[in-house]
């Protein structure tokens, strides 16, 4: 019996087609992805093949103005239109709190939403009961397939799930649910979830009875043969893991941003064992036409976005200096504003020991593309912020050793004076450079704001200590020459859309007046 699994993950609000790098589509003839194009391909496969499941491994939420405005209603609507069969909860599904998940998505989805390792307690337990499930048995043709869901246990550090959801260890939580499916005579089981490729592989290895793992969170691109675009494969598709009980378990993921549709064919024997698996992600490029009905509906929904982008978010009573003449040479108040917003967006998980789990921000000055003049009545709009941060990136959470941070700050000024983009703006950091010294030895003082303290203060950076830092995904991926970050980071979790972070902060503060205050000397 053959099953076709179509899968997406980490779509992050890319409802419209995008450019090849998943930013705003400029030249339509070279654009990719989007739900209208995805629909065309999915329908084509459904017509051609008998047993097709369409699955999503989480993080539909967060990433463009679509999510900012529609807050998840757009996800439910278009996923319903595509007739998804199941979705696993990702960490970003909690970005607007539990209510922001329940109302727009859980109550509106016409497909099961899954996570076996999230347990509700207290007053939330009855409110959310039945709205998401640990597993679902889906009839497919003349057979049944069990889908069991999982979500990153780091979600409380990455999003806003509140205090009434407990995120258990994935493997510990999955095993009893898989065992339950076995007792229900379900012998074909897919683990669908959002914990990253390393955890996906562990699930394949450790959870007895899981036949296939469909993952997300790490934006992993797997491919067999010559890859069709810029993404470099992290391994073959499917990636085969040998389980502890000797089975070959295929593990798949489909990069991110709706650029590819994962396509996996699995052959099962009559006892539900995987006989063979093969496939590849399908690049959703312009050779696949956008479905006209979906496209027309996208255009209808778009109208509200255009209106939103010119509305006032808040006011500034000072000039927001985002000029390259400032931000690539010295501390600039636009850099301070953005870093403050980045830290503010990550205020969560305080306890008796820690006032917050992260206190530091770094931001390449070259990523700040425009100032905002306060003389326009002080008004700040989404449109203004889109000029400052035009690349559609995210502000991510990484863990780095102090020694890596020191290298990053040396790189920041290794060719100072040439108006290059690697000059770092900061938050929660005081750095002193001596530019008379030779490149690679110019950082003379680097103090960082403590997190394990009741009164935050600046302490010297310790080379062997592990620190959490918020930074643009561009830097986490080694952009602007920050190869040391990419090579040496110990953990990387994707965060929220850059403009959304700053706009939320400005809306919260109402009036802003960021200063140049001696963070960089």
């Amino acid at each position: 019996w053959e099953l076709t699994i179509l899968h997406t993950n980490d779509v992050h609000s890319r409802l419209e087609q995008t450019s090849e790098d998943s930013s705003k589509c400029v030249n339509a003839s070279r654009c990719m992805g989007g739900v209208a194009r995805l629909f065309t391909k999915v329908q084509q496969i459904r017509r051609a093949e008998p047993n097709v499941l369409l699955l999503d491994a989480g993080d539909q939420y967060q990433g463009t103005i679509w999510f900012t405005v529609y807050k998840g209603a757009e996800v439910a609507h278009f996923m319903n239109a595509l007739r998804y069969d199941a979705m696993a909860l990702g960490n970003h599904e909690f970005d607007n709190g539990v209510e922001g998940l329940i109302e727009p998505l859980l109550k509106e989805a016409k497909f099961p939403i899954l996570s076996a390792n999230i347990k509700a307690k207290g007053p939330l337990a009855s409110q959310i009961s039945g709205l998401y499930l640990p597993y679902k048995v889906l009839p497919v043709g003349d057979e049944v397939v069990g889908i069991v869901g999982y979500t990153s246990k780091e979600t409380p550090f990455l999003s806003n799930p509140g205090t009434n959801l407990v995120f258990e260890d994935e493997i510990t939580a999955l095993q009893p649910e898989v065992d339950k499916l076995k007792t229900l005579n379900v012998n074909k089981i897919i683990a669908l979830g959002h914990s990253g490729f390393e955890t996906d592989k562990l699930i394949a290895q450790k959870v007895r009875g899981v036949d296939v793992v469909v993952g997300g969170h790490s934006n992993t691109f797997l491919y067999t043969g010559n890859p069709p675009s810029k993404e470099v494969p992290a391994g073959k598709y499917p990636f085969i893991v040998t389980s502890d009980d000797g089975r070959k378990v295929p593990v798949v993921q489909a990069y991110a941003f709706g650029k590819y549709l994962g396509y996996l064919k699995i052959e099962f024997d009559e006892r539900g064992n995987v006989i063979s698996s093969h496939g590849n992600p399908i690049l959703l490029n312009s050779s696949i036409p956008e479905d006209p009905s979906i496209k027309a509906d996208i255009n209808k929904w778009r109208i509200k976005l255009d209106n939103y982008s010119t509305q006032e978010l808040g006011k500034t009573i000072v000039y927001l200096d985002g000029s390259s003449q400032s931000c690539r040479f010295r501390e600039c108040n636009m850099g301070n504003l953005i870093c403050d917003a980045m830290i503010n967006n990550n205020l969560r998980h305080a306890d008796e020991m820690f006032w917050n789990h992260v206190s530091m921000c770094i931001l390449n000055g070259g990523g700040i593309r425009s100032p905002i003049d306060e003389r326009n009545n002080g008004t700040i709009t989404w449109e203004n912020l889109a000029a400052v941060l035009p690349f559609g990136g995210t502000f991510d959470l990484v863990q780095l050793k102090g020694s890596t941070l020191k290298k990053a700050f040396e790189h920041s000024v290794h060719r100072y004076g040439q108006s290059t983009g690697e000059f770092l703006q900061v938050g929660g950091i005081h750095v002193v450079y001596d530019l008379s010294r030779k490149p690679g030895d110019r950082v003379v003082k680097l103090d960082v704001l403590c997190t394990k303290c009741r009164v935050p203060s600046y302490d010297p950076l310790k080379m062997d200590e592990i620190y959490k830092v918020i930074l643009p995904n561009f830097l986490a991926n080694g952009g602007d020459g920050f190869q040391m970050i990419k090579d040496e980071l110990l953990r990387h979790d994707s965060g929220d859309q850059d403009i959304n972070v700053v706009s939320t902060y400005i809306s919260k503060m109402k009036v802003i007046y960021p200063a140049v205050e001696g963070r960089i000397k």
């Epitope: 319903n80 239109a81 007739r83 043709g141 009905s293």
Partner: antibody, heavy 119, light 108 residues
Framework: QVQLVQSGAEVKKPGASVKMSCKAS????????MHWVRQSPGKSLEWIGY????????TYNPKFEGRATLTVDTSASTAYMELSSLRSEDTAVYYC????????????WGQGTTVTVSS | DIQMTQSPSSLSASVGDRVTITCTAS???????LHWYQQKPGKAPKLLIY???NLASGVPSRFSGSGSGTDFTLTISSLQPEDFATYYC?????????FGAGTKLEIK
């Protein structure tokens, strides 16, 4: 043109089962969900459930879960509904209905199958 | 479940009259997923208006729909003889899908 043609009227005894068919034509059968709705004499419309023809995935109204079974034969572009453990209150006209994929309205209706449950 | 309450349950009117039928949902329904059907005796229902206010193909412009949240209306601006029928509202904003009990429009 797009149409749904349903099987003929049935008379059944309480406790029995009935299986009715709905043949689709004029469109790609797998592209649209097929719903089943019933209407008791002089009453309103009541939704039973739907099936995704491309993979036979089903969603039921909890009221009919376990008693209604929806199936398809894609090669024949035909949907089926079986209702078991019939009782007199199941006497109704049963419609198969195609739904729009974007806004889930019912744009094409079958002519209906009359089921009479009587001892 | 979302209950859909239609009023009136029946209505007598004359050709040329303006008629309004209301549909009240027990909880908020997105206007995108609120639809109206017309049914004549012995026939299957027929789609009349979809997504609150959009006329289905071939439906005369004397029919219109409006509303949001929990309150929706179907209006016939000038009744014609062929409009005498039963009208149903329907939501599939949330599962299970539900219909109103119907409004029977009769000739006075």
């Amino acid at each position: 043109q797009v149409q749904l043609v349903q099987s003929g009227a049935e008379v059944k005894k309480p406790g029995a089962s009935v299986k009715m068919s709905c043949k689709a034509s004029g469109y790609t059968f797998t592209d649209y969900n097929m719903h089943w709705v019933r209407q008791s004499p002089g009453k309103s419309l009541e939704w039973i459930g739907y099936i995704k023809p491309h993979n036979a995935g089903t969603t039921y109204n909890p009221k009919f879960e376990g008693r209604a079974t929806l199936t398809v034969d894609t090669s024949a572009s035909t949907a089926y509904m079986e209702l078991s453990s019939l009782r007199s209150e199941d006497t109704a006209v049963y419609y198969c209905v195609r739904s729009d994929f974007l806004y889930w309205y019912f744009d094409v209706w079958g002519q209906g199958t009359t089921v009479t449950v009587s001892s | 479940d979302i209950q859909m309450t239609q009023s009136p349950s029946s209505l007598s009117a004359s050709v040329g009259d303006r008629v309004t039928i209301t549909c009240t949902a027990s909880s908020s329904v997105s206007s995108s997923y609120l639809h109206w059907y017309q049914q004549k005796p012995g026939k299957a229902p027929k789609l009349l208006i979809y997504s609150t206010s959009n006329l289905a193909s071939g439906v005369p412009s004397r029919f219109s729909g409006s509303g949001s949240g929990t309150d929706f209306t179907l209006t016939i601006s000038s009744l014609q003889p062929e409009d005498f029928a039963t009208y149903y509202c329907h939501q599939y904003h949330r599962s299970p899908l539900t219909f109103g009990a119907g409004t029977k429009l009769e000739i006075k």
